[in-house]
């Protein structure tokens, strides 16, 4: 062992450095002292440190560590926070557009329905937004409420416009008849399937991003243990006690210390990796009926088709409803709700410019690629922090926690530290409670992401229609079907690309839903199906 260089006889350098940490010099000895009261920087000879200095060094070391950790995660944190905000806003834009498309469809095709239809459409899309943001709303209930509310208006305004006012108290009966008679055919069920699948995925995607932020925030603000503070002090500051102001810690030693300090945090690594890979799988499956943009922007068309379906069966429906609702007191249904003041969103919607005309799906894929570059973030943290704090290159002529050494040996360092502090003990303590909690949250979201990840290949249940549509109305590619009908089916591709160029107003004449509206090629109700023993299409 080379003899340590003679300490500063006056502790002058130590005093000037320490003054930067703590104004005032009352704690710094003027000349080296025995230091028998020291607990961390155990001296091999006279020392320029006191117990109070040691405590201050420990506090500073822990603060340094927290700052290093925060700067290590800054880029990742910003990436997730920014994307969570961008996607949340983008989803809101899609919902607003979907609402305006649907309102425009009513305005252009069914003007007599508009005041009430606008209200019901508005309520439906408000619920959609709330659901995406995590509200405890059932998607099937939302869709049922939309159609339950629409049917009485369709029946009284479109199918029987001459109905006397005295007959308008049949709203309750009509709401019930809507489900009993399946007046919209299979369309509500189609919408339920598409909307619930796409919104579930959207919601879990946002939840996952928000949890990502929470994970980073949690590890960002970790309070390091006293044991860790002692190790950091020994690594960063104990050399000062010997007057070795310019000596840097050995790289290998830094890694050992950081692994000890970060043992709990590093336990997140496994779940963090799984989180990013599960999120990637979810994103890869977000297309067709699992893509809310695709589904919501096509809703106006499906709703239009469903109304045409009702109109096509107007005669038969009127016969049955005349029978069921003539004595409506005989039948009990939930009460309908029609507020007095009808809210009509006439606002011109201009879409926020999306850079490079990118679509939501390309933006999602881009995010995943960036996140994947952070897949080893937690396992790499100890090394990252060491590389971003002063360490000696090649482990030569460096500080090993006790003395200046020519070459760092992990074994020697461990032996030397045995009595002072046990690294193994630190690792065995397990993660902080907050880290355990965040690991549990990651496990939970990973499980959700796994269950939500789409099966490859066909994604739509083949047996959507227990009533036996004669053939899949959307051809072989049912999972791409938005319009729910054979010809003129609208498939919305690269939505945000055209949204970016769209200044949309309810008064636009060529609004979606104005032309080439598709109708179901086979009418379930008014068609007998030669399918043998299948669920009755005539019921």
């Amino acid at each position: 062992q080379p003899p340590p260089p003679p300490p500063d006889a006056t502790c002058h350098q130590v005093r000037s450095f320490f003054q930067r940490l703590q104004p005032g010099l009352k704690w710094v000895p003027e000349t080296p002292v025995p230091g028998s009261d020291l607990q961390v920087c155990l001296p091999k000879g006279p020392t320029c440190c006191s117990r109070k200095m040691e405590e201050k060094y420990q506090l500073t070391a822990r603060l340094n560590m927290e700052q290093l950790l925060q700067s290590a995660s800054m880029e990742l944190k910003f990436l997730i926070i920014q994307n969570a905000a961008v996607f949340q806003e983008a989803f809101e834009i899609v919902v607003r557009h979907a609402k305006n498309y649907t309102n425009a469809m009513f305005k252009n095709n069914y003007p007599s329905l508009t005041p009430q239809a606008f209200e019901f459409v508005g309520e439906f899309f408000t619920d959609v937004s709330l659901y995406i943001l995590g509200s405890d709303i059932n998607v099937d209930d939302m869709v049922n409420e939309l159609f339950d509310s629409l049917f009485p208006v369709i029946y009284t305004q479109l199918m029987n416009p001459g109905l006397p006012d005295s007959a308008l108290d049949i709203n309750e009966c009509l709401r019930g008849a809507r489900r009993d008679l399946k007046v919209f055919g299979n369309f509500p069920k189609l919408i339920m399937t598409q909307v619930s699948k796409s919104l579930q995925v959207t919601r879990i995607f946002l939840q996952a991003l928000n949890l990502g932020i929470e994970v980073i925030n949690t590890t960002d603000h970790l309070k390091f243990s006293k044991d860790c503070g002692r190790m950091l002090t020994r690594m960063w500051y104990c050399s000062y006690c010997q007057g070795l102001m310019m000596v840097k810690p050995c790289g290998g030693y830094c890694n050992v210390v950081m692994q000890g300090c970060m043992a709990g945090v590093v336990e997140i690594d496994k779940y963090w990796r799984e989180y990013i890979l599960s999120l990637e799988e979810l994103v890869n499956g977000m297309y067709r009926i699992y893509d809310m943009e695709n589904v919501l922007l096509g809703l106006f068309s499906t709703i239009h088709d469903s109304i045409q379906y009702v109109q096509k069966n107007a005669g038969k429906l009127t016969t049955t409803i005349g029978k069921l609702c003539a004595h409506s007191q005989q039948r009990q249904y939930r009460s309908a709700y029609y507020p007095e003041d009808l809210f009509i969103d006439k606002k011109v919607l201009k879409v926020a410019h999306v850079e490079h005309e990118e679509t939501l799906s390309s933006r999602r894929r881009e995010l995943i690629q960036k996140l994947k570059s952070f897949i080893s973030f937690y396992s790499a943290l100890p090394g990252y922090i060491c590389s971003h704090s002063p360490v000696a290159e090649n482990d030569t002529l460096c500080w090993n926690g006790q003395e200046l050494v020519e070459r760092y040996s992990q074994k020697a360092a461990r032996n030397g530290m045995k009595n002072q502090f046990n690294l193994h003990e630190l690792k065995m303590k397990g993660p902080e409670p907050v880290v355990s909690q965040i690991i549990d949250k990651l496990k939970h979201i990973n499980q959700l992401l796994r269950t939500m990840s789409m099966p490859k290949g066909r994604v739509l249940d083949k047996n959507l229609d227990e009533e036996g549509f004669e053939s899949g109305d959307c051809g072989d590619d049912e999972d791409e079907c938005i319009g729910g009908s054979g010809d003129g089916m609208i498939k919305v591709k690269n939505q945000l690309r055209f949204l970016a160029e769209l200044a949309y107003d309810l008064d636009v004449d060529d609004a979606p839903g104005n032309s080439q509206q598709a109708t179901p090629k086979d009418n379930e109700i008014s068609t007998f199906h030669n399918l043998g023993n299948v669920h009755s299409p005539l019921k």
Epitope: L181, K316, T320, I525, S526, L531, H535, L538, K539
Partner: antibody, heavy 118, light 113 residues
Framework: EVQLQQSGAEHVKPGTSVRLSCTAS????????IHWVKQRPEQGLEWIGG????????EYDPKFPGKATVVADTSSNTAYLQLSSLTSEDTAVYYC???????????WGQGTTLTVSS | DIVLSQSPSSLAVSVGENVTMNCKSS????????????LAWYQQKPGQSPQLLIF???TRESGVPDRFTGSGSGTDFTLTIRSVKAEDLAVYYC?????????FGSGTKLEIK
């Protein structure tokens, strides 16, 4: 008032064919479905088949292959049941019935008695 | 085909008594999308056409006295006549209109003692 008026009793020889009619009043047959039901003497009810007069789509019980044909004439608001290759097994009362959308048979004709014998 | 089994095949009761008859289906008649059972009950008096009493297993047809009650769900259904009257002498049929071919039960003959 909704009514279904069926044609009178028929007495025919085996091997021949017969056409029974059912004329609706009080509603348009296009606004419902018309079905036919068979009831042999002292027996239960058997569904034969039905028609959607709006588009002439039909559905039959597989037990009556080629035996029964249901047609509708919307201009006269009448539905018909054509029975061919008659045998004594076809001796029965034949009812027409209206079926509103989503419901069972709510109005029935008075029935037509068909007797097949030589 | 869906088979409907009615029981008993006949029963004799005195005027004023309550009567119950059953109809069992070989398949469920409940439509999950609207929670309706596609089962009807008809009454056929001697020499007359059948008349609809109950649809959707439990909804009384307009004009049918409230002493007739339908109940049950899935595969097991019941028609109850409370305080039987002499005019209730008839054969009662259940029918499924859940899927083609539509089928009827064999009937329960109600006789008055």
């Amino acid at each position: 008032e909704v009514q279904l008026q069926q044609s009178g009793a028929e007495h025919v020889k085996p091997g021949t064919s017969v056409r029974l009619s059912c004329t609706a009043s009080g509603f348009n047959i296009k606004d419902a479905y018309i079905h036919w039901v068979k009831q042999r003497p002292e027996q239960g009810l058997e569904w034969i088949g039905g028609i959607d007069p709006e588009n002439d789509n039909t559905e039959y019980d597989p037990k009556f292959p080629g035996k029964a044909t249901v047609v509708a004439d919307t201009s006269s608001n009448t539905a018909y049941l054509q029975l061919s290759s008659l045998t004594s097994e076809d001796t029965a009362v034949y009812y027409c019935a209206r079926r509103p959308l989503g419901l069972p048979f709510d109005y029935w004709g008075q029935g037509t008695t068909l007797t097949v014998s030589s | 085909d869906i088979v409907l089994s009615q029981s008993p095949s006949s029963l004799a009761v005195s005027v004023g008594e309550n009567v119950t008859m059953n109809c069992k289906s070989s398949q469920r008649l409940l439509d999950s999308s609207n929670q309706r059972n596609y089962l009807a009950w008809y009454q056929q008096k001697p020499g007359q056409s059948p008349q609809l009493l109950i649809f959707w297993a439990s909804t009384r047809e307009s004009g049918v006295p409230d002493r007739f009650t339908g109940s049950g769900s899935g595969t097991d259904f019941t028609l109850t006549i409370r305080s039987v009257k002499a005019e209730d002498l008839a054969v009662y049929y259940c029918q499924q209109y859940y899927s083609y071919p539509f089928t009827f039960g064999s009937g329960t003959k109600l006789e008055i003692k």
